[in-house]
């Protein structure tokens, strides 16, 4: 028997520095977690103690903090090289800055293979990107070899900016021939490493013949056997065992997100490459694990540029950006309109001739807006200003909801109107009319939404049974501010880009902004 230790991360999302327990900015260092310096300490400890170790990443290193905003992926290559990762799969967020933003900072600089079997380049890009990412890689580990085959969510064109010269194929269809190829090369230990979410990970384990282990990402799934060490609630045991169609027991793992845990899986193979046993658990990277001094020093050196960036002008406003609670928790506010417009703009994807865009709607809890911006400061808007408006370090995510769920959400928006509560919704691509003289739960008298399957966008009445795509803060997708109906009834949820980054990119693109209050939210006569 031969034993392999798989260490794995996924959905790190730019958390190079240690974070608080909820993966936001570290406030009290004695209770902070994760970060590449601490990760390196644990990885090195395991490498010293165990003979056959692989360190793998299942994608979405990109996007999530000011580190990515400033360094644009160069930080990912640098610190993943320093940690000596053995392989990485491409995630959807690796395409956030387009293909160029993947090739130059990461693909050309990484000293480890970057993988995806279901992304096929075409046209002029094919030769430019050739060899920079691979469908699979055979890695020597001790006296043996292990095949790693990569995959990426086929939804990436809707979630990021891969452009028109990359085709995202069905994962299972694309993986099988690559695994077969590995088998013909006498590679009998094969890991599928990828970024399509836990449901797809399980399907790959079930359907792709020859895959021995699946290491996944995208769905931020936390698996654990026994009593979990922090506040994440396990979605199942670690590893999660799937019985394949050909009768094998295939371990499937994921390690939550944000570098809070290091996945730790021990696999025992027989001489024919069959999995005899698998066990392990994610390791919580808490403050009991010291940060490696040399990596920490490097982090501090790279940090300097971030502090300078915070005060640089992103663009200008020629109007007062009203982010006051008096406005945003009671009525349409132009700061809410600005943020929603930025959220939609960040999700412009012309993937189908029938649709001007795949999503037209935005909702945003007024309580999430935490500061106005005064135009009398020469109109200057900085990252620092935006960090005061959006101080909680969230993401703007893409969900699919039925019209009936949206109606419930808008009823919830005003169910206790008038108390300066945070659930009052700011919107984009939506026209809503409330009648506050009616009883709570029956106050939405008109709800029109901007069409997507149209060449000239116009507002049509919401249909209760139709499925709509909506951009919203992750806080709402997770049921925050009492929006339990969103959490309970959402049909799909894909995590998006860092909130401040979305707004800063929009302002930089527009250069000068002047959002207005324009009748997106109205109150019918007699009630307001």
């Amino acid at each position: 028997a031969w034993e392999l230790t798989i260490l794995h991360t996924n959905d790190v999302h730019s958390r190079l520095e240690q974070t608080s327990e909820d993966s936001s900015k570290c406030v009290n260092a004695s209770r902070c977690m994760g970060g590449v310096a601490r990760l390196f300490t644990k990885v090195q400890q395991i490498r010293r103690a165990e003979p056959n170790v692989l360190l793998l990443d299942a994608g979405d290193q990109y996007q999530g903090t000011i580190w990515f905003t400033v360094y644009k992926g160069a930080e990912v290559a640098h610190f993943m090289n320093a940690l000596r990762y053995d392989a990485m799969a491409l995630g959807n967020h690796e395409f956030d800055n387009g293909v160029e933003g993947l090739i130059e900072p990461l693909l050309k600089e990484a000293k480890f293979p970057i993988l995806s079997a279901n992304i096929k380049a075409k046209g002029p890009l094919a030769s430019q990107i050739s060899g920079l990412y691979l469908p699979y890689k055979v890695l020597p580990v001790g006296d043996e070899v292990v095949g790693i085959v990569g995959y990426t969510s086929k939804e990436t064109p809707f979630l990021s900016n891969p452009g028109t010269n990359l085709v995202f194929e069905d994962e299972i269809t694309a993986l099988q021939p690559e695994v077969d190829k590995l088998k013909t090369l006498n590679v009998n230990k094969i890991i599928a490493l990828g970024h399509s979410g836990f449901e797809m990970d399980k399907l790959i384990a079930q359907k792709v013949r020859g895959v021995d282990v699946v290491v996944g990402g995208h769905s931020n799934t936390f698996l654990y056997t026994g009593n979990p060490p922090s506040k994440e609630v396990p979605a199942g045991k670690y590893p999660f065992i799937v019985t394949s169609d050909d009768g094998r027991k295939v371990p499937v793992v994921q390690a939550y997100a944000f570098g809070k845990y290091l996945g730790y899986l021990k696999i025992e193979f027989d001489e024919r490459g069959n999995v005899i046993s698998s066990h392990g658990n994610p390791i919580l990277l808490n403050s009991s694990i010291p940060e490696d001094p040399s990596i920490k020093a490097d982090i501090n050196k790279w940090r300097i540029k971030l502090d300078n960036y915070s005060t640089q002008e992103l663009g200008k406003t020629i109007v007062y950006l009203d982010g006051s609670s008096q406005s945003c928790r009671f009525r349409e506010c132009n700061m809410g309109n600005l943020i929603c417009d930025a959220m939609i703009n960040n999700n412009l994807r012309h993937t189908d001739e029938m649709f001007w865009n795949h999503v037209s709607m935005c909702i945003l809890n007024g309580g999430g807006i935490r500061s106005p911006i005064d135009e009398r400061n020469n109109g200057t808007i900085t990252w620092e200003n935006l960090a005061a408006v959006l101080p909680f370090g969230g993401t703007f995510d893409l969900v699919q909801l039925k019209g009936s769920t949206l109606k419930k959400a808008f009823e919830h928006s005003v169910h206790r109107y008038g108390q300066s509560t945070g659930e009052f919704l700011q919107v984009g691509g939506i026209h809503v009319v409330y009648d506050l003289s009616r009883k709570p739960g029956d106050r939405v008298v008109k709800l029109d939404v901007l069409c997507t399957k149209c060449r000239v966008p116009s507002y049509d009445p919401l249909k209760m049974d139709e499925v709509y795509k909506v951009i919203l803060p992750n806080f709402l997708a997770n049921g925050g501010d009492g929006f339990q109906m969103i959490k309970d009834e959402l049909l799909r949820h894909d995590s998006g880009d860092q909130d401040i980054n979305v707004v800063s990119t929009y302002i930089s693109k527009m250069k000068v902004i002047y959002p207005a209050v324009e009748g997106r939210i109205k109150f019918s006569t007699g009630s307001h």
Epitope: D22, S324, S325, Q326, R329, R370, S371, P372, R416, Q484
Partner: antibody, heavy 116, light 105 residues
């Protein structure tokens, strides 16, 4: 995150007192702020709240018209001006951020004693 | 909106499973929090939104309920859990329950 209350002490019935709460370690101007009090040996009683930029204020019925909450975001400080004090206002006064939410932090409290 | 906690005090031993209940005078959806307070200290948030565990709080604490009836459960009492517990609604202007004193048996 640190919240430090000050300004408590002994005051006669009908008198006034101004409490302060100095905040550090977080973006004070982004958070709604509350005052909560606790009479000796009794339970917790919410007193007042002020929104992050100061435009919304709400008070408990027991203090309405007598107490005024205010803040100075440039000084990272929350205040509670207490007028027409009564014996039943005797309590430890806590300032707190966004109570009952993820960003929930409390100070250590300052004792106000109203007695003749 | 009034909050009524029960019991007002209870005695239990280390390792016991303990349940404290809180009833709102009208429906408050899931706008309910649970606090722990030790003598001479500020209250500490345990649970918010009826069932969400605050960061750093041990997983032996859990909350449930919606509408008018809510429960705080400590699955296996530890010595440091002996304290006073308060529920608090934030549906309207905040209001605390009268407290439940948890003592060592």
């Amino acid at each position: 995150v640190q919240l430090v209350e000050s300004g408590g002490g002994l005051v006669q019935p009908g008198g006034s007192l101004r409490l302060s709460c100095a905040a550090s370690g977080f973006t004070f101007s982004s958070y709604d702020m509350h005052w909560v009090r606790q009479a000796p040996g009794k339970g917790l009683e919410w007193v007042a709240v002020m929104s992050y930029e100061g435009s919304n204020k709400y008070y408990a019925d027991s203090v309405k018209g007598r107490f005024t909450i205010s803040r100075d975001n440039s000084k990272n400080t929350l205040y509670l001006q207490m007028n027409s004090l009564r014996a039943e206002d005797t309590a430890v006064y806590y300032c707190a951020t966004e109570i009952a939410a993820k960003g929930d932090y409390w100070g250590q409290g300052t004792l106000v004693t109203v007695s003749s | 909106i009034q909050m009524t906690q029960s019991p007002s005090s209870l005695s239990a031993s280390v390792g016991d499973r303990v349940t404290i209940t809180c009833r709102a005078s009208q429906g408050i959806s899931n706008y309910l929090a649970w606090y722990q307070q030790k003598p001479g200290k500020a209250p500490k948030l345990l649970i918010y939104a009826a069932s969400t565990l605050q960061s750093g709080v041990p997983s032996r604490f859990s909350g449930s309920g919606s509408g008018t009836d809510f429960t705080l459960t400590i699955s296996s009492l530890q010595p440091e859990d002996f304290a006073t517990y308060y529920c608090q609604q934030s549906y309207s202007t905040p209001h605390f329950g009268q407290g439940t004193r948890l003592e060592i048996k």
